[in-house]
């Protein structure tokens, strides 16, 4: 498959296991890979009562599932972990729940960037 | 054409050590992350270590924790596992694997396994 | 570390069949859930990546589905080249772990 209109060159890179795995915590993720392969920004979190927790952002390998997906969405009802990837520079910034059965869409916004 | 070689292989006594080589060739080796695969005689697949592409990061299987060591030369295009305090449950086909550098790193490449052996 | 367990561990089938091979997580993996083929004394091959995506070259008869702790490799249509072991595996922890496998034997 060629790459896609959006192409994904840079996502927002977070390990929540960071300390664990011995990797940064977050950052950028420049995504590299075969020519002819397309590649995505993904984002998977927990949602806990409302309570979000973020586990894991970065770059993904060639997925038809996210192909020409300018938003981050997750559709599962309820999964223990959310899962969403969409193409284009640092798409995973903001996330999105939407449920493909109906339901409220909630959309998780990166907390502002503290002052240096 | 991609292709990983193992090599180092053999009959070593328990307590001894070994060290497993394995040659890439026809890919930027720097740009992928590498693992190894064991699998004993009859048995299933079981995920040894793991490396980043800098090999700054290394992941090790509980079985083999502290006795095991992964490591790779880039400038070499070369990835090695030092084997110490041999156990006769360590005898196996070991793997190396190739894996993308970004999520979910499946292996994608492997090379064709050298056979260790731990006996007295 | 997470557990991955296969089912059934062997089965038997005839060429042109349908065959479904379950895989289940102690925990949710997401998608990060890989699939692969061994044949007697050779190497695994990559089979399907992020539990539903065909590695190149594969044939279109496999197919993967599923998502959290429940995954299905699916062969659509039985070819003689595909009486093989099937594993498992989940890249979602640094921990690597494969499932014990699926022997897919001639009926």
């Known amino acids: 498959s060629g790459r896609g209109e959006a192409e994904t060159r840079e996502c927002i890179y977070y390990n929540a296991n960071w300390e664990l795995e011995r990797t940064n915590q977050s950052g950028l993720e420049r995504c590299e890979g075969e020519q002819d392969k397309r590649l995505h920004c993904y984002a998977s979190w927990r949602n806990s009562s409302g309570t979000i927790e973020l586990v894991k952002k970065g770059c993904w390998l060639d997925d038809f599932n996210c192909y020409d997906r300018q938003e981050c969405v997750a559709t599962e009802e309820n999964p223990q972990v959310y899962f969403c990837c969409c193409e284009g520079n640092f798409c995973n910034e903001r996330f999105t729940h939407l449920p493909e059965a109906g339901g409220p869409e909630v959309t998780y916004e990166p907390p502002p960037t503290a002052p240096t | 054409e991609v292709q990983l070689l193992e090599s180092g292989g053999g009959l070593v006594q328990p307590g001894g050590s070994l060290r497993l080589s394995c040659a890439a060739s026809?890919?930027?080796?720097?740009?992928?992350?590498m693992g190894w695969v064991r699998q004993a005689p009859g048995k299933g697949l079981e995920w040894v270590s793991s490396i980043s592409t800098s090999g700054g990061s290394t992941y090790y299987a509980d079985s083999v924790k502290g006795r095991f060591t992964i490591s790779r030369d880039n400038s070499k295009n070369t990835l090695y596992l030092q084997m110490n305090s041999l156990r006769a449950e360590d005898t196996a086909v070991y793997y190396c694997?190739?894996?993308?550098?970004?999520?979910?790193?499946?292996?994608?490449?492997w090379g064709q396994g050298t056979l260790v052996t731990v006996s007295s | 570390d997470i557990q991955m367990t296969q089912s059934p561990s062997s089965l038997s089938a005839s060429v042109g069949d349908r065959v479904t091979i379950t895989c289940r997580a102690s925990q949710s993996v997401s998608r990060f859930l890989n699939w692969y083929q061994q044949k007697p004394g050779k190497a695994p091959k990559l089979l399907i990546y992020a539990a539903s995506n065909l590695q190149s070259g594969v044939p279109s008869r496999f197919s993967g589905s599923g998502s959290g702790t429940d995954f299905t490799l699916t062969i659509s249509s039985l070819q003689p080249e595909d009486f093989a072991t099937y594993y498992c595996?989940?890249?979602?922890?640094?921990?690597?772990?494969f499932g014990g496998g699926t022997k897919v034997e001639i009926k």
């Open positions: 026809g890919f930027a080796f720097s740009s992928y992350a």
């Open positions: 595996q989940q890249s979602y922890s640094s921990l690597f772990t």
């Open positions: 694997a190739r894996s993308p550098a970004h999520s979910p790193h499946p292996f994608d490449i």
